[in-house]
């Protein structure tokens, strides 16, 4: 009798021990995971995060669609709606260069760096060549008339515009439009001005920064968060809190991301900080990620979202700050009338696009999203989409703009910058992070469930035997 009872009790004890061990392993395992993650996401020599941060292992592509103007003469002569036809994609490989001037500052636990710019054309991923021609707004004419509203200066400019045979629109190759060309009108200006113009001029052989970000050594919750940009905590482009540099650069976020979080990040392309909110769970190459999207609220007018009041910097074009979906970044572009929006004026007010024909906004193609692995905070896939527009206004001093009867926010191009973790990297990530966490979770569950089942089964058997013996 004793042997059987002893055996049952031993079984129950083993079950209990397994269950307790499984239960203990949960917080202990979580602690181990947290400890490992905290160690590996710090931005210092020797960590996984640092290696990928210095030079992204992901191939990043920037696709461009150019808005080819179909009716330049009618616009110039009759102030007609601008008819555009998008042509693209024209694809470039970008962000392939390693960060430069990386300097750790142990005093304040930051690391500073420059992000070099470079773009390599990818013909196989493009619809044409860099020599393709497009009819686009004359960037120099539109900008000059805006920067110099003074009537005297405009009369002088008008004579130079006419002399150079420039017009409201121009024909340019893709390479010229993106990376720069010598403008014939600006070449005649008798005082010192840059005669080269381009949507991204200068780009190659330049760098963005200096960025100074927290390395996470003192507090992992601050890792990758920008401390200063170009030596300042503010941008000097906006009023009040709109001018703050918030969050990271969106390449990664502090680890242990929650769905309820609002992820702040700074984008030098749009000269402001912005935010993303959780949208859905996504499985990316076997890795569970959170999809965060830029909400329409971020592009709303101050009427709809009072938080945006300091992004409205002028009253006329914005119709007393009631227009939405476009951001005037002229302060950040030496006074050039550049407006940023989502492609095809997605989330923009009807008055913005009423002067343009041929646009078809849709969320799937034109919104921006970030797919973030929540444990590490790494952005494993993203699509950054934005449109660059230029304001052109009537001018009764500049002949080629004289017949315009209204303001136009003219779309020049839109871009889609994408990056997705490669298959090899994903496999490595699965085995090193997801796999280990899943394995640990599995062991915890097996121990706990086997332990509980054993304990309950042996205890029932023991009780049954005891009651038989007593009878």
């Amino acid at each position: 009798g004793c042997d059987r009872n002893c055996g049952l009790i031993t079984g129950a004890v083993i079950g209990a021990v397994l269950a307790v061990f499984g239960g203990i392993l949960m917080p202990v395992g979580d602690m181990l995971i947290q400890k490992t993650i905290k160690k590996e996401v710090v931005l210092e020599e020797g960590t996984i995060a640092f290696k990928n941060w210095v030079k992204t292992g992901t191939e990043i592509y920037r696709q461009f669609w150019i808005f080819d103007v179909q009716n330049p003469q009618e616009v110039m002569m009759n102030s007609s709606n601008i008819q555009v036809k998008q042509r693209g994609p024209y694809t470039y490989r970008v962000r392939f260069l390693a960060k430069e001037n990386i300097t750790q500052d142990p005093k304040d636990n930051t690391v500073s760096f420059l992000q070099p710019n470079g773009a390599i054309f990818e013909p196989s991923l493009s619809v044409g060549t860099e020599a393709d021609n497009f009819t686009v707004l004359n960037l120099a004419v539109a900008a000059a008339s805006h920067i110099y509203p003074n009537p005297f200066v405009q009369v002088v400019l008008n004579s130079l515009i006419n002399k150079s045979k420039s017009s409201m629109f121009q024909v340019r190759t893709l390479r010229e439009l993106l990376w720069g060309y010598t403008d014939p009108f600006l070449s005649l200006v008798p005082y010192p001005v840059s005669t080269r113009v381009g949507m991204f001029y200068p780009y190659n052989n330049t760098a963005d920064g200096v960025y100074k970000v927290f390395n996470g050594k003192d507090s992992i919750s601050k890792v990758a968060i920008i401390d200063t940009y170009k030596g300042k905590r503010n941008l000097s482009y906006w009023e009040s809190y709109c001018d703050m540099i918030n969050g990271t650069d969106a390449a990664s976020f502090p680890p242990f991301v929650e769905k309820s979080q609002v992820l702040q990040f700074f984008s030098s392309d749009i000269c402001r900080s912005i935010y993303a909110v959780f949208e859905s769970d996504v499985n990316l190459k076997g890795i569970p990620v959170y999809r965060f999207v830029l909400p329409s609220k971020a592009f709303a007018s101050p009427v709809q979202n009072p938080d945006n009041h300091c992004f409205c910097t002028e009253k006329i074009i914005s119709k007393n700050c009631t227009s939405y979906g476009v951001l005037d970044i002229s302060k950040c572009k030496e006074g050039k009338p550049v407006y940023i929006s989502l492609p095809h004026f997605l989330y923009a007010s009807p008055d913005v696009s009423e002067t343009i024909d041929g646009l078809n906004p849709n969320e799937e193609e034109h919104r921006t999203y970030l797919d973030i692995e929540p444990i590490t905070g790494f952005t494993l896939q993203f699509a950054k989409r934005l449109q660059v527009n230029l304001l052109v206004k009537p001018s009764n001093k500049i002949q080629v703009l004289k017949r315009l009867k209204r303001n136009y926010i003219v779309p020049i191009l839109w871009l889609n910058e994408t990056g997705t973790i490669g298959d090899e990297k994903a496999k490595m990530f699965r085995s090193q992070v997801t796999g280990k966490i899943n394995l640990l979770g599995l062991i915890e569950m097996i121990l706990l469930s086997v332990g509980v089942v054993m304990f309950v089964a042996f205890m029932i058997s023991y009780c049954a035997c005891r009651s038989k013996t007593i009878k």
Partner: antibody
Framework: QIQLVQSGPELVKPGASVKISCETS????????MHWVKQSHGKSLEWIGG????????KYNQKFKGKATLTVDKSSSTAYMELRSLTSEDSAVYYC???????????WGQGTLVTVSA | ETTVTQSPASLSVATGEKVTIRCITS??????MNWYQQKPGEPPKLLIS???TLRPGVPSRFSSGGYGTDFVFTVENMLSEDVADYYC?????????FGAGTKLELK
């Protein structure tokens, strides 16, 4: 309010030079063009030229090229016009006049009488 | 260079009468015509700017019209304070050019 105050009358000998000043106050000096206008006794007005202080861009009436030189001193918000190789033909009242955002000669100085006499 | 021909050179008008001054330009200047008033011993004063725009503070009896090459300046009912020289200025192109002026006197 916006004021343009010109230097006093000048009596100069033929062949000499003269530099007239126009001191401004009450506005952002660099953002508006400063023009100079000549008015001979009992005659109409003639535009000499203009200068945009922001970048120093100048434009002259061909008739006054070589005769007038326009300059500015941003630190003191003052515009200057120098007239050289003076003859009796140059005897006149010279005005400085400033643009407004979209308006020509919105504000005027009180005028400086230049008399060229041996 | 755009030449501006202003007429008449002088005009003698009784109080309450209508005054019309005309300026004709040698080139098409759209509506880039301005009108100035100059009283003795004073600098000119802008009355009407481009686009036939009456400047703030200028009495509504002053008006102008015209487009292209033919422009008219009108004083609806003459007052003694309107005695002055009047000049038109074309601001379409450089050099800026003035009309020869019209001397307006009381009859």
């Amino acid at each position: 309010q916006i004021q343009l105050v010109q230097s006093g009358p000048e009596l100069v000998k033929p062949g000499a030079s003269v530099k007239i000043s126009c001191e401004t106050s009450g506005h952002t000096f660099t953002e508006y063009t400063m023009h100079w206008v000549k008015q001979s006794h009992g005659k109409s007005l003639e535009w000499i030229g203009g200068i945009y202080p922001n970048n120093g861009a100048t434009k002259y009436n061909q008739k006054f090229k070589g005769k007038a030189t326009l300059t500015v001193d941003k630190s003191s918000s003052t515009a200057y016009m120098e007239l050289r190789s003076l003859t009796s033909e140059d005897s006149a009242v010279y005005y400085c006049a400033r643009d407004r955002y979209d308006v020509w000669f919105a504000y005027w100085g009180q005028g400086t009488l230049v008399t060229v006499s041996a | 260079e755009t030449t501006v021909t202003q007429s008449p050179a002088s005009l003698s008008v009784a109080t309450g009468e209508k005054v019309t001054i005309r300026c004709i330009t040698s080139t098409d200047i759209d509506d880039d015509m301005n009108w100035y008033q100059q009283k003795p011993g004073e600098p000119p004063k802008l009355l009407i700017s481009e686009g036939n725009t009456l400047r703030p503070g200028v009495p509504s009896r002053f008006s102008s019209g015209g487009y292209g090459t033919d422009f008219v300046f009108t004083v609806e009912n003459m007052l003694s304070e309107d005695v002055a020289d009047y000049y038109c200025l074309q601001s379409d192109n450089l050099p800026l050019t003035f009309g020869a002026g019209t001397k307006l006197e009381l009859k």
